[in-house]
Interface confidence: medium
């Protein structure tokens, strides 16, 4: 007689990352009997929702249901029907919604209400939609990458599962760059975390971790660009802004009302004698870098050392995984290789920004112009943030690993969020039972 395959005893979970520029849905899968083992959860699907971030729906909330439909229907297809009712769905909104909440708590609640109502119509176990804090975003990103790298496992492997994995149990720091905020999270070396707001204590798999984290709201790449434009237009002599962060020959008209729409530009707001201005690219890395540095206030620090804007930052320690926009931007610029030094990255950025816009458009014909036009700024911003903001040096640059996926799962906060909410990271090391690896008949 033929052996009949037993049905796969697996579980699924869904997390929607409602970011400032877009929403992504992630589907995770794991063996049901190994829930507490480290490294067993993996991503089986990512679905990017077509359209902007949910905060942009504030004046058209009735479109949210339609906006989420394609990816939720995709989840229905991917997850076996028998599992639908047991599959938890979580939506976490990040800095785009934090900014909307700063402007109007009522409008932010309204958007979340409509999201909640839309997601409740699917046959999954909807667990709620909420705005996660910057601290949570940093912490869950740190948990994700260390979980996927096997850092919480007590068994030291004799083989390496990813190229940059060191075979010790030292955790990786996490560097996350979004559109509206950026997070830095790591375990400092025997250093007191001087500001309580930046300190997290975890007990995971029987080990204690004292973790530093901070989320810089308004310092994601999109909001940083708005900040830079608002700062620079203050000193423009007319409605032409000659901008070194855009390629020579690039032109774009910006509405002043759009510039001042975000709370991130409030500190630069002034009455201008025009309603619109034109960005004219001049493509100069060095000048762009200097302009970006003016966004970081380094003149004030009430601690032993700071990142910028008076925020405590302990001395950097160990290896770091840089993901989300850190990875996407550097990947586009072909600068993610471990072999590329910081000096080489700077050199390549100088060349890239100096390339004429027409030439860039021809070289990258398949890329949307809106995104294409901003890579010079974004690449320069990443260098400025890592070097001057977080105090990486030419030497410590080699400890930054630009990571997109680890073993097929995206690096980001969503996996850590789900692991936490489904109680899949035990505080204590699970006892291994003889039956957990093979079954005796």
């Amino acid at each position: 007689t033929q052996n009949k395959a037993l049905p796969e005893n697996v579980k699924y979970g869904i997390v929607l990352d409602a970011g400032s520029s877009h929403t992504s849905l992630y589907i995770y899968k794991w063996p049901a009997e190994k829930e507490n083992d480290t490294g067993v959860v993996h991503q089986v699907e990512e679905c990017r929702v077509k359209g902007p971030g949910i905060s942009k729906f504030v004046q058209k909330v009735n479109e949210i249901g339609i906006y989420l439909t394609d990816c939720m229907e995709r989840a229905r297809e991917v997850i076996p029907r028998s599992q639908h009712q047991e599959t938890p769905v979580y939506l976490g909104a990040t800095a785009g919604m934090r900014l909307l909440r700063m402007e109007s708590e009522e409008l932010a609640d309204r958007v979340l209400d409509v999201v909640e109502r839309s997601l409740s119509n699917y046959p999954f176990d909807f667990q709620g939609a909420r705005i996660i804090t910057g601290q949570e975003e940093g912490a869950y990103g740190w948990i994700t990458i260390n979980y996927l790298l096997g850092k919480f496992s007590q068994k030291t492997r004799w083989f390496s599962i990813v190229p940059y994995e060191t075979n010790n149990q030292e955790t990786f720091g996490a560097l996350d760059l979004g559109g509206a905020s950026t997070q830095v999270t790591f375990v400092p070396q025997n250093q007191t975390i001087e500001s309580p707001d930046n300190a997290l204590q975890f007990r995971l798999y029987g080990k204690d971790y004292n973790v530093y984290t901070h989320s810089f709201l308004c310092y994601g790449k999109d909001q940083a660009l708005w900040q830079k434009l608002a700062k620079d237009i203050q000193v423009a002599s007319n409605e032409i802004l000659r901008d070194p962060c855009f390629h020579p020959g690039y032109k774009k008209v910006v509405n002043v009302s759009d510039l001042y729409k975000t709370p991130c530009t409030k500190r630069f707001e002034m009455t201008l004698p025009f309603q619109q201005f034109e960005i004219q690219g001049i493509g100069n890395y060095q000048q762009c870098h200097q302009s970006i540095l003016e966004l970081f206030n380094t003149s004030y620090c009430p601690y032993s050392q700071c990142a910028f804007n008076g925020i405590f930052l302990p001395p950097l320690q160990g290896d770091f995984g840089a993901f989300s926009a850190f990875y996407f931007v550097m990947k586009f610029l072909n600068l993610t290789s471990e072999k590329v030094s910081q000096e080489k990255v700077t050199e390549m950025m100088k060349k890239f920004c100096a390339q004429p816009w027409e030439e860039i458009k021809t070289s990258y014909a398949g890329v949307k112009e809106k995104y294409l036009s901003e890579y010079c700024f974004s690449g320069t911003y990443i260098l400025s943030l890592l070097l001057q903001g977080y105090h990486f040096t030419a030497d410590s640059w080699e400890h930054i690993h630009f990571i997109g996926k680890i073993q097929g799962s995206d690096a980001g906060w969503t996996l850590g969020y789900m692991l936490n909410l489904t109680n899949m990271i035990p505080a204590e090391q699970p006892l291994s039972t003889p039956l957990s690896h093979s079954t005796y008949v």
């Epitope: 009522e106 309204r110 109502r117 119509n121 046959p123 999954f124």
Partner: antibody
Framework: QVQLVQSGAEVKKPGASVKVSCKAS????????MYWVRQAPGQGLEWIGR????????KYNEKFKNRATLTVDTSISTAYMELSRLRSDDTAVYYC???????????????WGQGTTVTVSS | DIQMTQSPSSLSASVGDRVTITCKAS??????IGWYQQKPGKAPKLLIH???TLQPGVPSRFSGSGSGRDYTFTISSLQPEDIATYYC?????????FGQGTKLEIK
């Protein structure tokens, strides 16, 4: 035509449970949410919770969270509300009411059941 | 939760009178308000939704207006069959809330 028909009056003792049904007809059951609202004698209206028939997802008024259970049987287009650990102040008329789901301007209750009187008395 | 303060709690008017009931929300509800009529022993009946949209079959003497936090329900010419209790309902937030009700009597 669209209607919601509820089960008959109930008399229960304190500590017992009651399960009220609400049968929908004249429309696609899964295209509307079902809410449950109660009205104590001489009092105003208060909502207990709601259920999305398409998924079974529920949301409860904090006040009833641990005592009310909402369920649906889509095969017979019927919604149920069970209230446990009954007290004398649960004596009220219990209504089911449907609400639109797709557009937020349709979230009001447009059709109501006729009401089910539940009396809790020792 | 959004609180709805309805006033008056009761009122007495003559046939043909213009009657006004108000509901004030604890925050902006963006016109997401409905008005219901309930007669003794009956279920509430929807008269108006989205501040001023009359339900099909509801007489035109009933109307609604308002924006932000302040809303008004009006019966332009009171008829004997209008004797009932009237409730407002906010559906701006997922946690719906009713006003306390206004009992309308004929003088």
């Amino acid at each position: 035509q669209v209607q919601l028909v509820q089960s008959g009056a109930e008399v229960k003792k304190p500590g017992a449970s009651v399960k009220v049904s609400c049968k929908a007809s004249g429309y696609t059951f899964t295209n509307y949410w079902m809410y449950w609202v109660r009205q104590a004698p001489g009092q105003g209206l208060e909502w207990i919770g709601r259920i999305a028939p398409s998924s079974g997802a529920t949301k409860y008024n904090e006040k009833f969270k641990n005592r009310a259970t909402l369920t649906v049987d889509t095969s017979i287009s019927t919604a149920y509300m069970e209230l446990s650990r009954l007290r004398s102040d649960d004596t009220a008329v219990y209504y089911c009411a449907r609400s639109g789901i797709y557009y937020d301007y349709d979230w009001f209750f447009d059709v109501w059941g006729q009401g089910t009187t539940v009396t809790v008395s020792s | 939760d959004i609180q709805m303060t309805q006033s008056p709690s009761s009122l007495s008017a003559s046939v043909g009178d213009r009657v006004t009931i108000t509901c004030k929300a604890s925050q902006d509800i963006n016109k997401y308000i409905g008005w219901y009529q309930q007669k003794p022993g009956k279920a509430p009946k929807l008269l108006i939704h989205y501040t001023s949209t009359l339900q099909p079959g509801v007489p035109s003497r009933f109307s609604g207006s308002g924006s932000g936090r302040d809303y008004t329900f009006t019966i332009s010419s009171l008829q004997p069959e209008d004797i009932a209790t009237y409730y407002c309902l906010q559906y701006h937030a997922l946690l719906f809330t009713f006003g306390q009700g206004t009992k309308l009597e004929i003088k």
